[in-house]
Interface confidence: low
């Protein structure tokens, strides 16, 4: 009675099961009754990750420096090429096929967490006694000046996007 | 090759609202921001968002929050953009252009859809 | 929101000569990766708007090497070096770098 399913790393072919071709190899052609299942290393700048069936191994993927990309990890006979972008740009997709730049915090608003690879800026509104003058990617925002450490009165109060301004103590005379 | 297709021209009432389709293929879709832009008769463009189909994230051009409900579906490759309480000066072509990043441009374009607000 | 000024408002031009249209940002369109993300697109009549250039000087895929852009900060310009019929219809600038996206008012080229 020919088989109706095969053992792990096996498949039906011609009611016989052949023995699947390992990954980093494609398969050249099928077992026979006399003869093995032949397969064949994949050539340069292609992979195969499982343990397979098929005739053409995949390109690895093109880190386009078009669209902001570059090479985070080289791809082996196994394993694809990992895509991860450009200084200042984070990935669009968990795929990261494409780019986009890090959004910028604006003033009155400091970064909470810096943009990584794959993450976009997290931008914070500055709190009472703190403020960011600034449009950026990377200033936190900065305490209020103490003027009372630099013996100095408040002269103009601070806002989220605006240091105090200090001043001298009137002295009586 | 890429090719955005918009649903086709609307007439609509006062008040009511509409939704714009724009079915994108020859890319993968999740990868690539659908942006949608306004062109008033006779007038420029005019940048209404976009949505990162992929996480679903959306930015709006301030004039038109709340008014415009940007929504992607992966499933179908199609991105959608809807306006609410209708005005007639909401008569206008609405074009949905993909971002082609990096290029940080929007490379390619829908064939536009009239949307036209009448009593 | 950064304003985009486009002059001429209208274009008159002669097949095989020259043509230049201007276009100035209320700010600098200069990221700090040194990327200008000012881009040109032109909308024939009739038809969806397409790109022409993008990042100030990069020419998109298809478009002829007549078209060139120039610039930088705030002041750009878009080349024509030798208008041909098909070139008419309606230019815009349009920058990138700051949300919400803006665009020029357009500039009108026809032929004289």
């Known amino acids: 009675e020919p088989p109706t399913a095969c053992r792990e790393k096996q498949y039906l072919i011609n009611s016989q099961c052949c023995s699947l071709c390992q990954p980093g190899q494609k398969l050249v052609s099928d077992c026979t009754e006399f003869t093995e299942t032949e397969c064949l290393p994949c050539g340069e700048s292609e992979f195969l990750d499982t343990w397979n069936r098929e005739t053409h191994c995949h390109q690895h993927k093109y880190c386009d420096p078009n669209l902001g990309l570059r090479v985070q990890q080289k791809g082996t006979s196994e394993t694809d090429t990992i895509c991860t972008c450009e200084e200042g740009w984070h990935c669009t997709s968990e795929a990261c096929e494409s780019c986009v730049l890090h959004r910028s915090c604006s003033p009155g608003f400091g970064v909470k967490q810096i943009a990584t690879g794959v993450s976009d800026t997290i931008c914070e509104p500055c709190p009472v006694g703190f403020f960011s003058n600034v449009s950026s990617a990377f200033e936190k925002c900065h305490p209020w000046t103490s003027c009372e450490t630099k013996d100095l009165v408040v002269q103009q109060a601070g806002t989220n996007k605006t240091d105090v301004v200090c001043g001298p103590q009137d002295r009586l005379r | 090759q890429v090719q955005l297709v918009q649903s086709g021209a609307e007439v609509k009432k006062p008040g009511s609202s509409v939704k714009v389709s724009c079915k994108a293929s020859?890319?993968?879709?999740?990868?690539?921001?659908m942006n949608w832009v306004r062109q008033a008769p006779g007038q420029g463009l005019e940048w209404m968002g976009n949505?990162?189909?992929?996480?679903?994230?959306?930015n709006y051009n301030q004039k038109f929050k709340g008014k415009t409900t940007l929504t992607a579906d992966k499933s179908t490759s199609t991105a959608y953009m809807e306006l609410s309480s209708l005005r007639s000066d909401d008569t206008a072509v609405y074009y949905c252009?993909?971002?082609?990043?990096?290029?940080?441009?929007?490379?390619?374009w829908g064939q536009g859809t009239l949307v036209t607000v009448s009593s | 929101d950064i304003v985009m000024t486009q002059t001429p408002l209208s274009l008159p031009v002669t097949p095989g000569e020259p043509a230049s249209i201007s276009c100035r940002s209320s700010?600098?369109?200069?990221?700090?990766?040194?990327?200008?993300?000012l881009h040109w697109y032109l909308q024939k009549p009739g038809q969806s708007p397409q790109l022409l250039i993008y990042?100030?000087?990069n020419r998109f895929f298809g478009v002829p090497d007549r078209f060139s852009g120039s610039g930088s900060g705030t002041d750009f310009t878009l080349k024509i070096s030798r208008v041909e019929a098909e070139d008419v219809g309606v230019y815009y600038c349009?920058?990138?770098?700051?949300?919400?996206?803006?665009f020029g008012g357009g500039t009108k080229v026809e032929i004289k």
């Open positions: 700010q600098s369109l200069v990221h700090s990766n040194a990327n200008t993300y």
């Open positions: 990042k100030l000087t």
């Open positions: 949505i990162d189909p992929y996480y679903g994230n959306t």
């Open positions: 252009a993909r971002l082609g990043l990096q290029l940080y441009a929007l490379d390619y």
């Open positions: 349009s920058q990138s770098i700051h949300v919400p996206w803006t």
């Open positions: 020859g890319y993968t879709f999740t990868g690539y921001n």
